[in-house]
């Protein structure tokens, strides 16, 4: 807490300007009127205040707005946002995308902080869903944002917002998240033609079921190995050698380099060695000729 001291004669601030950088903490506290500060917040970011001086300005705003700052002040916080705590931000009602953008701009390049996470949470909850404009903004500042959401939170993303998602936005998503996003992407891109559809859906395929992979294998898509390696193991296992060959096209040769890794390893174990040999890649570990394959999952389903 800064002690309450009288403002020295002639030092009362008439406006927020650069002369204030020469004020000591106690002079800022005594000589700057909180209401003046609130109306001239847009000037603060142009003035090279130290973090210590910003603490004093924050204290003045906190006293003026104990229930939380109005959006007119929030939009112009600038570097003062770096001094806010998640508790401060929980008191705010941010409705304008412009305000959100202004605050994310201050944090550009920073790691995702609890302050930013709280701000985004408040904003998205206020909107009711993660609409396309918001998602566009968030992923522009934080490419990993989408993958930081839980499957439950992702379920509120409307399919129309999927158009804003770039491949790099999904880099850190796990299979549970892709399980939620894939059906939305399929719906969003359903009216596109084959090759265009594949380009758009490719980064979401970690959530695709077997039947969709089978369908893609009939469309000459030439899936690359990096995408194939991210597919769900349980979705890959039922694919035949012929289907995988069609799915990968010229990239099928890459299976050899990945034969020890999932899902390739597990898929090989499910194929007849005869069928694997037709690829001419020297893949080993398939079911030897003459062995009977029992599908235990089907047996369990019947019982």
């Amino acid at each position: 807490e800064v002690e309450k001291t009288a403002c020295p004669s002639g030092k009362k601030a008439r406006e927020i300007d650069e002369s204030l950088i020469f004020y000591k903490k106690w002079e800022l506290e005594a000589c700057v009127d909180a209401a003046l500060l609130a109306t001239q917040m847009d000037r603060v970011n142009a003035i090279p205040f130290t973090y210590e001086q910003l603490d004093v300005l924050k204290h003045k705003l906190d006293e003026l707005y104990p229930q939380g700052y109005p959006e007119s002040v929030i939009q112009h916080l600038g570097y003062l946002f770096l001094k806010m705590s998640p508790e401060d931000i929980r008191k705010w009602n941010v409705t304008s995308l412009e305000t959100l953008k202004a605050l994310l701009e201050v944090n550009k390049g920073h790691e995702m902080s609890p302050q930013v996470a709280t701000l985004i949470d408040r904003f998205v909850k206020g909107r009711g869903q993660l609409d396309k404009d918001t998602l566009d903004t968030l992923t522009a500042f934080y490419p990993g944002y989408l993958c930081s959401l839980s499957p439950e939170e992702l379920s509120s993303v409307p399919p129309s917002s999927i158009w804003a998602v770039r491949p790099q936005d999904l880099d850190t998503c796990d299979p549970r998240q892709l399980d939620v996003l894939y059906p939305k992407a399929r719906l969003a891109f359903q009216n596109m033609n084959g090759s265009e559809y594949f380009v758009k859906i490719q980064s979401f395929l970690g959530g695709a079921p077997t039947e969709d992979l089978k369908a893609l294998s009939q469309q000459n898509v030439s899936m690359d190995l990096a995408t194939f390696m991210k597919l769900r193991t349980d979705a890959v296992l039922p694919l035949t050698v012929a289907e995988v060959q069609k799915l990968l096209g010229p990239h099928v040769e890459g299976l050899k380099a990945e034969e020890r890794h999932r899902p390739v390893r597990d898929w090989i174990l499910r194929q007849r060695q005869d069928d694997l040999d037709t690829l001419g890649l020297g893949l080993q570990g398939g079911i030897p000729n003459g062995y009977l394959v029992l599908d235990l999952s089907m047996q369990e389903a019947l019982s």
């Epitope: 950088i21 003035i47 130290t50 973090y51 210590e52 570097y79 770096l82 920073h110 302050q115």
Partner: antibody, heavy 117, light 107 residues
Framework: QVQLVESGGGLVKPGGSLRLSCAAS????????MSWIRQAPGKCLEWISY????????YYVDSVKGRFTISRDNAKNSLYLQMNSLRAEDTAVYYC??????????WGQGTLVTVSS | DIQMTQSPSSVSASVGDRVTITCRAS??????LAWYQQKPGKAPKLLIS???RLQSGVPSRFSGSGSGTDFTLTISSLQPEDFAIYYC?????????FGCGTKVEIK
């Protein structure tokens, strides 16, 4: 008086790791943001990272993002820089500095990191 | 990133001379500029913050001016202990960036 003393530098092979420390005294460490700045031999100064007093706000320059991790222990008045996947271009004198927002008001003497095979 | 360009890269001067060093920012940084002095084998030392605010304990022969993109550090009467490298640094936006220095040498 304010004092910052870096340690932990040395010779390391490319791909190796080092952990730098900065011991602070003469001020209330937990009240201040702290930064790491480096200077390659005969080159410009390069600010590489900072951390807020509470550790909630962190920034890395692109050249070290994903390889370096800044942290602090306010109870021990110490700032750290964990450096992984080191490259020849990371060879520099590393300074810790007290960061007051508009400038760095106090600097340590620096610790030399040499990355070479 | 904001680029900081210092000129000249070196200057030869005599004791008692007036020396002026300039720093130009690639975009408007208002007055978010600091100047530092570095002597061989030593850490940089803060001279001026906020473009013109003299740091406590720094001799008054040092002064800073400028705003926007063009800034100046002036040493009104060079002293023997002033031979060093001088750096400017912007703090208007992240990442903070430094100029590459101006070396003040003995003529």
């Amino acid at each position: 008086q304010v004092q910052l003393v870096e340690s932990g530098g040395g010779l390391v092979k490319p791909g190796g790791s080092l952990r730098l420390s900065c011991a602070a005294s003469g001020f209330t460490f937990s009240d201040y943001y702290m930064s790491w700045i480096r200077q390659a031999p005969g080159k410009c100064l390069e600010w590489i990272s900072y951390i807020s007093s509470s550790e909630s706000i962190i920034y890395y320059v692109d050249s070290v993002k994903g390889r370096f991790t800044i942290s602090r222990d306010n109870a021990k008045n110490s700032l750290y820089l964990q450096m992984n996947s080191l490259r020849a271009e990371d060879t520099a004198v590393y300074y810790c500095a007290r960061d007051v927002g508009s400038h760095f008001d106090y600097w340590g003497q620096g610790t030399l990191v040499t990355v070479s095979s | 990133d904001i680029q900081m360009t210092q000129s000249p890269s070196s200057v030869s001067a005599s004791v008692g001379d007036r020396v002026t060093i300039t720093c130009r920012a690639s975009q408007d940084i208002s007055r978010w500029l600091a100047w530092y002095q570095q002597k061989p084998g030593k850490a940089p030392k803060l001279l001026i913050s906020a473009a013109s605010r003299l740091q406590s304990g720094v001799p008054s022969r040092f002064s800073g001016s400028g705003s926007g993109t063009d800034f100046t550090l002036t040493i009104s009467s060079l002293q023997p202990e002033d031979f060093a490298i001088y750096y400017c640094q912007q703090a208007k936006s992240f990442p903070r960036t430094f100029g590459c220095g101006t070396k003040v040498e003995i003529k």
